[in-house]
């Protein structure tokens, strides 16, 4: 992973108790919407809260959502695939059931 010094970009022992900086949230920052997060990150649920997570790169596993209402609340969400990528079934991943097939971010 990218080894940044804290979740919100201050020195490692800072607890972000001061709101002096209004910069966009770094990876791990608590957020309410993706516009709260820095470029390359999206706001996705991580159970206790939503946090800024990296937008997915080519080859990374992604979540293909079925019809709205057909699945329960995801408590550990992934971001969406980055620009020029879409979440598709991995071609060489053969599974017995359609629903358990592995999806990855692939070039359009």
């Amino acid at each position: 992973g990218n080894d940044h010094s804290t979740l919100d970009g201050y020195s490692r022992r800072t607890t972000l108790s001061s709101k002096m900086y209004h910069s966009k949230g770094q990876e791990g920052s608590v957020c309410l919407r993706s516009s709260d997060c820095a470029t390359g990150l999206c706001c996705a649920r991580h159970f206790w809260s939503k946090i800024c997570k990296p937008v997915l790169k080519e080859g990374q596993v992604c979540t293909k959502h079925r019809r709205k209402g057909s699945h329960g609340l995801e408590i550990f969400q992934r971001c969406y695939c980055g620009e020029g990528l879409s979440c598709r079934i991995q071609k060489d991943h053969h599974q017995a059931s359609n629903s358990s097939r592995l999806h990855t971010c692939q070039r359009h």
């Epitope: 992973g1 804290t6 607890t15 108790s17 791990g28 991580h46």
Partner: antibody
């Protein structure tokens, strides 16, 4: 099955440090954060901070920032919480948590 | 001053319905951060009871329900049972503290 197994009880003298471990199994360790929460006898739950198991990035609660260090060893899927300059009111049960799963707790007693 | 305030104790007879409130402010519950509820039996780690305001994990009876409105949240236990006697904590995030916060805790006593 997700499990968080914590180290055994500790008795420390005031001014000393304690390092509590939390060994994770049953999931991909680097995909999750580990939080540390403590509970003094007869008191409520108090969040201390978290560590990103992948990058090692940390965020600490204001109260603990000068005394706590959270770390992890990805090769053994273990997270650590070290608290220094212990005082008697640090006597508490210390829990690690993946948010949805919790360890059973490590009792730390600070006594002269 | 506590960030999330709960009644220190509530009680009810078996079969009754009890409600536990969790009062926050505009920097936590009122800022649209989620609320989770934990049950803690003596000497054990907290057990997740309700997550993301009103969702029950598998294994939690449907007698337990949660809701959130404005700057407060509530846990309702319908058809109280003896085994429900425990401590209950709400939990959320506070953007003025930049910290996860727990409620003050409520001791539920089942009468009789």
């Amino acid at each position: 099955e997700v499990q968080l197994v914590q180290s055994g009880a500790e008795v420390k003298k005031p001014g000393a440090s304690v390092k509590v471990s939390c060994k994770a199994s049953g999931y991909t360790f680097t995909d999750y954060y580990i939080h540390w929460v403590r509970q003094a006898p007869g008191q409520g739950l108090e969040w201390m901070g978290w560590i990103h198991s992948n990058s090692g990035a940390t965020t600490y609660a204001q109260k603990f920032q000068a005394r706590v260090t959270m770390s992890r060893d990805t090769s053994s899927s273990t997270a650590y919480m070290e608290l220094s300059r212990l005082e008697s009111d640090d006597t508490a049960m210390y829990f690690c948590s993946r948010e949805d799963y919790w360890g059973k707790g490590t009792m730390v007693t600070v006594s002269s | 001053q506590a960030v999330l305030t709960q009644p220190s104790s509530v009680s009810g007879a078996p079969g009754q319905r009890v409600s536990i409130s969790c009062t926050g402010s505009s920097s936590n519950i009122g800022a649209a951060y989620d609320v989770h509820w934990y049950q803690q039996l003596p000497g054990t780690a907290p057990r997740l009871l309700i997550y993301v305001n009103n969702n029950r994990p598998s294994g939690v009876p449907d007698r337990f329900s949660g809701s959130k409105s404005g700057t407060s949240a509530s846990l309702v236990i319908a058809g109280l049972q003896a085994e429900d006697e425990a401590d209950y904590y709400c939990q959320s995030y506070d953007n003025s503290l930049n910290a996860y916060v727990f409620g003050t805790g409520t001791k539920l006593t089942v009468l009789g």
